[in-house]
């Protein structure tokens, strides 16, 4: 992890990097590696992509072990093929208001994505896209046969917008905080970021936190009950310790993770909180990192990686952080 030892590189030839990712010397000047990209974890040995103006932000001087690849102050953003200046706000579509800050984009939804539970007035609630309307709206399908009252269908669950209002006014500052982005990894340790000006100087700043939607080694499909298609929040059998680039959390955590579905839906964090976690490294150094902890998950068809970059961005976000 650090550069104190002699150079030791893998025997294979230099790695092949994905398109747009630079092949660079590691931070020790030893081996050629694929540069880490914006928002990825970085170390002294795993440097960030210098050709994109990225540097490894360790957060505080005490945490010189593991950082997050961050754009230099004032770096522009490329979003949907358009370049935006740092500090510039833009409407990426009728559904989202976004802000570029030092190479990172944070977006806030403009559409309410409420959830509706069945009732006598609306036994079969559905969200639909109406012609000429940007935001989806609720429609209430009446039972096909009005004389038969069937069981109420489960609420059509897209995404909730419950939790604190992201916009409030405080002492000449319109406080704005974007949602936490989805975790950068669908399993294992990743990064989630947001942009906020909720600070004493009312200046936009980026915040990041570690996140783990589910462990990579977990075979969750085995736990799905017979006749069911999903396991939303699997029961955790034993407390675990988190690992981060060779460092281990000092405490054990009975953390919740999101499950899986067998019918094409994906399960993602729905309500989360942010807590500090202390990691102890092999050399005895202790570092504190903020980490996402899952309260509840939701299973839905709005899975990440779909064609519409706005949709995947929007539906992957986590709302209602209760830190």
């Amino acid at each position: 992890q650090n550069c104190s030892g002699p150079c030791r590189c893998p025997d294979e030839p230099a790695p092949r990097c994905p398109a747009g990712v630079s092949l660079v010397l590691d931070g020790c000047g030893c081996c050629r590696v694929c540069a880490k990209q914006l928002g990825e974890l970085c170390t002294e040995r795993d440097p960030c992509d210098p050709h994109k103006g990225l540097f490894c932000d360790f957060g505080s001087p005490a945490n010189r072990k593991i950082g997050v690849c961050t754009a230099k102050d004032g770096a522009p953003c490329i979003f949907g093929g358009t370049v935006y200046r740092s500090g510039e706000s833009f409407q990426s579509s009728c559904k989202y208001q976004c802000t570029c800050l030092d190479g990172a984009v944070g977006c806030m939804p403009l559409c309410s994505m409420d959830v509706r539970l069945p009732s006598p007035d609306c036994p079969f609630p559905r969200r639909v896209k109406l012609p000429g309307k940007c935001c989806e709206e609720w429609v209430c399908d009446e039972p096909k046969d009005q004389t038969v009252v069937g069981p109420a269908l489960a609420a059509y669950r897209l995404e909730d917008t419950f939790g604190p209002d992201p916009t409030m006014i405080r002492a000449n500052c319109l406080v704005q905080t974007t949602e936490w982005s989805a975790c950068s990894k669908t399993c294992g340790m990743g990064i989630s970021t947001r942009v906020t000006n909720d600070n004493a100087s009312c200046r936009l700043e980026k915040q990041s936190r570690l996140c783990m939607v589910r462990p990579c080694e977990a075979d969750l499909e085995e736990n799905i009950k017979k006749g069911k298609k999903c396991i939303r929040t699997p029961k955790i059998s034993k407390p675990i310790k988190f690992e981060l680039s060779g460092c281990t959390s000092m405490k054990t955590y009975r953390a919740k993770f999101c499950g899986v579905c067998t019918d094409g839906r994906c399960c993602t964090p729905h309500r989360t909180t942010t807590l500090p976690v202390e990691f102890k490294c092999p050399d005895g150094e202790v570092m504190k990192k903020n980490m996402m902890f899952i309260k509840t998950c939701a299973c839905h068809y709005n899975c990440p990686g779909d064609n519409d970059i706005f949709e995947s961005l929007y539906y992957r976000k986590m709302y209602g952080d209760m830190a």
């Epitope: 959830v115 509706r116 539970l117 069945p118 007035d121 609306c122 609630p125 069937g150 109420a152 269908l153």
Partner: antibody
């Protein structure tokens, strides 16, 4: 963010008419119905009335002759009037959104006394 | 007059399971009663937990589940947490009106 807020007089004299307003935000009254519920001190909840998304209304039969519920969708307001108030009507009055009674207002306490 | 009856109080230990029920005086509760469960924690506003018999609100933890059990509406809490201590009300729909139960005061020991 979905919110409901009740407003109205704190003190009402016996035989007078109580008018309560529920002002909502974060959803449309053309999409969701709104219920009125009350809770007398130390007692259980009591359902009073509902105005549905399409404007239809239903009432608790015990109060039907005394209650009227209406809405102004453009103002996002639902109004409940209760005539011939009596000291036994002293309670905290709540409005709640239809659909699992998912969101409630904080309630407004009404005392009926001469 | 239709009466909806709930257990006045129940006590459970943390981590335990408890079932709150909601009985109708005019027969078995069915899905057409659209059973709702509402929670009020001390000093907090009411909020809906379950609607339409078994549908959870977005903020309702997975340990809460709504069902029909033996002709009654039921709210089952498995793996009870200290923060689940609250008053729970059920409400049933009867074609033209709702009726609330008397409420169950759930106490979590410890």
């Amino acid at each position: 963010e979905v919110t409901l807020k009740e407003s109205g007089p704190v003190l009402v004299k016996p035989t007078e008419t109580l008018t309560l307003t529920c002002t909502v935000s974060g959803f449309s009254l053309s999409t969701f119905g709104v219920h009125w519920i009350r809770q007398p001190p130390g007692k259980a909840l009591e359902w009073l009335a509902v105005i549905w998304r399409r404007g239809g209304t239903d009432y608790n039969a015990a109060f039907m002759s005394r209650l009227t519920i209406s809405k102004d969708t453009s103002k996002s307001q639902v109004v409940l009037t209760m005539t011939n108030m009596d000291p036994v009507d002293t309670a905290t009055y709540y409005c709640a959104r239809d659909g699992g009674f998912d969101y409630w207002g904080q309630g407004t306490t009404v005392t009926v006394s001469s | 007059e239709t009466v909806v009856t709930q257990e006045p109080s129940l006590t459970v230990s943390p981590g335990g399971t408890v079932t709150l029920t909601c009985r109708s005086s005019i027969g078995a509760v069915t899905t057409s009663n659209y059973a709702n469960w509402v929670q009020q924690k001390p000093g907090q506003a009411f909020r809906g937990l379950i609607g339409g018999t078994s549908n959870r609100a977005p903020w309702t933890p997975a340990r809460f589940s709504g069902s029909l059990l033996g002709g009654k509406a039921a709210l089952t809490l498995s793996g009870v947490q200290p923060e689940d201590e609250a008053e729970y009300y059920c409400a049933l729909w009867y074609s033209t009106h709702y009726v609330f139960g008397g409420g169950t005061k759930l106490t979590v020991l410890g």
